[in-house]
C-alpha cells in the first residue's frame, strides 16, 4: 500500500480466484483514543472499532471511502483504491491501447519543435468517475524538472457504438536546451482512476523522435509565362524552433489529381519553392520533416491547381 | 427463531491455540455483516474481528491482528475464530453476534488463558 495523495491510498493486489488479498492497517488521524469506530462508504454498517483498524483487502467491495466517527462525529477518512496485478502484469484496463507505433501504446507524445514543449495523448471508452494526473521528468535516477499543466478532454469521437474520449496535456521542460544533444530520455508518468480501480502508464522518449512539424504556411502558387509550370512557394511554421539556418527543415512537394487513382508527382528539396506541373482539378500539397533526423512528417498545406 | 451459540471456549496456556465456534440458525450468515466481541471481567466490551459479505473479507482489532483469524462456512452457517499465540489479556467471554449493536448475539464461550 502507499498514498497517492493525502487521504487516498492505493493497495496493490495480485488478482486471481481466491486470491487472499492484502491486510491493511488504517489508523483514524485524531488525538483521540477511545469510543472510535468505522464505516465504509455510505454504509451506516459498523466495520470495527479502534484508533486503527486492521481490513483484509480482496476485491473492489473492500475498496472506498473508510470512515472514523466518534459520537456521531466524523474525525477521518482514507480512500483506498485497487491496482490490479494478472498474471505478473498491472492492468491496463482504462485506457486504449492505440496500437501506433506499435502494441501496448496507450500514450502518445508530440513536439513540434526544439523547445522542450510537447503534448501527450490518450484514449478512453469511458465517460464519468475518471482522473489523470501526469508527472514528467528528464532522466529518473537523477530526474530534471517538466512541468505538465492539467489532463483536459481534447476530443470526443463516435467509434461504432462506441463514444471514445481524447484527453491531452501538454508539458514543458524546465531548463530545455534546443541545440543540445539528448543523452537522458523524457519519462512521462500518468496516474488514472476510474471509480475505485488506480492505473498508471508510462512513456520514455527523446524529443528529437516525437518531433512532427506544423504544416508548411503561406502556400502559394504563381503560374509561369507560356508554361504548364507554376512555381510552388511557402514558409516555415511558426511554430518551427530557430534559427532555420541551424534548425532546418526538408520539404515534399505533390500534385494529385482528383482522384485517389491518379499517379501522383512528388519532388523533394530544401528550399521553400519548387517548381511543378499543375494538372486541372489537381491540388498542390506541401510537408516538412526535420532535415537532419527522419522524425515525422508534419500533415500536408494544401492549395488547388486552379 | 434466530439463534447463535457459541462454542470452544476453555482454559489454555500462554502461547497456545483455540478455535471458537459459533452456530446460527434462522438466517444466513453469509447474506450479513458477522462479528465476534469480547468482554474481560469488569471491562466493556470489546470488538474483535468482522468478516463480511461477499468474498467474506476480514478486518481485526489492534490487540488481535496477525493472532487471530475470523472465518465461516457457508453450508455449515458457522462463524469461526482460530486464536493463535494466546496470551493473559486475551481471558475474556466471547461471543458472535450479527450486528454492531448485539440486538442478535449469542450467550458467549469463556476463555481462560493461565499457567
Known amino acids: 500500500i502507499w498514498e497517492l495523495k493525502k487521504d487516498v491510498y492505493v493497495v496493490e493486489l495480485d488478482w486471481y480466484p481466491d486470491a487472499p488479498g492484502e491486510m491493511v492497517v488504517l489508523t483514524c488521524d485524531t488525538p483521540e483514543e477511545d469510543g472510535i469506530t468505522w464505516t465504509l462508504d455510505q454504509s451506516s454498517e459498523v466495520l470495527g472499532s479502534g484508533k486503527t483498524l486492521t481490513i483484509q483487502v480482496k476485491e473492489f467491495g473492500d475498496a472506498g471511502q473508510y470512515t472514523c466517527h466518534k459520537g456521531g462525529e466524523v474525525l477521518s477518512h482514507s480512500l483506498l483504491l485497487l491496482h490490479k496485478k494478472e498474471d505478473g502484469i498491472w492492468s491496463t484496463d482504462i485506457l486504449k491501447d492505440q496500437k501506433e507505433p506499435k502494441n501496448k501504446t496507450f500514450l502518445r507524445c508530440e513536439a513540434k519543435n526544439y523547445s522542450g514543449r510537447f503534448t501527450c495523448w490518450w484514449l478512453t471508452t469511458i465517460s464519468t468517475d475518471l482522473t489523470f494526473s501526469v508527472k514528467s521528468s528528464r532522466g529518473s535516477s537523477d530526474p530534471q524538472g517538466v512541468t505538465c499543466g492539467a489532463a483536459t478532454l481534447s476530443a470526443e469521437r463516435v467509434r461504432g457504438d462506441n463514444k471514445e474520449y481524447e484527453y491531452s496535456v501538454e508539458c514543458q521542460e524546465d531548463s530545455a536546451c534546443p541545440a543540445a544533444e539528448e543523452s537522458l530520455p523524457i519519462e512521462v508518468m500518468v496516474d488514472a482512476v476510474h471509480k475505485l480501480k488506480y492505473e498508471n502508464y508510462t512513456s520514455s522518449f527523446f524529443i528529437r523522435d516525437i518531433i512532427k512539424p506544423d504544416p508548411p504556411k503561406n502556400l502559394q502558387l504563381k503560374p509561369l509565362k507560356n508554361s504548364r509550370q507554376v512555381e510552388v512557394s511557402w514558409e516555415y511554421p511558426d511554430t518551427w524552433s530557430t534559427p532555420h539556418s541551424y534548425f532546418s527543415l526538408t520539404f515534399c512537394v505533390q500534385v494529385q489529381g482528383k482522384s485517389k487513382r491518379e499517379k501522383k508527382d512528388r519532388v523533394f528539396t530544401d528550399k521553400t519553392s519548387a517548381t511543378v506541373i499543375c494538372r486541372k482539378n489537381a491540388s498542390i500539397s506541401v510537408r516538412a520533416q526535420d532535415r537532419y533526423y527522419s522524425s515525422s512528417w508534419s500533415e500536408w498545406a494544401s492549395v488547388p491547381c486552379s | 427463531e434466530v439463534q447463535l451459540v457459541e462454542s470452544g471456549g476453555g482454559l489454555v496456556q500462554p502461547g497456545g491455540s483455540l478455535r471458537l465456534s459459533c452456530a446460527a440458525s434462522?438466517?444466513?450468515?453469509?447474506?450479513?455483516?458477522m462479528y465476534w466481541f469480547r468482554q474481560a471481567p469488569g471491562k466493556g466490551h470489546e470488538w474483535v474481528s468482522t468478516?463480511?459479505?461477499?468474498?467474506?473479507?476480514?478486518a481485526y482489532a489492534d490487540s488481535v491482528k496477525g493472532r487471530f483469524t475470523i472465518s465461516r462456512d457457508n453450508a455449515k452457517n458457522t462463524l469461526y475464530l482460530q486464536m493463535n499465540s494466546l496470551k493473559p489479556e486475551d481471558t475474556a467471554l466471547y461471543y458472535c453476534?450479527?450486528?454492531?449493536?448485539?440486538?442478535?448475539r449469542g450467550q458467549g464461550t469463556q476463555v481462560t488463558v493461565s499457567s
Open positions: 453476534a450479527r450486528d454492531w449493536d448485539g440486538t442478535v
Open positions: 434462522g438466517f444466513s450468515i453469509s447474506d450479513n455483516w
Open positions: 468478516i463480511k459479505t461477499g468474498t467474506g473479507s476480514t
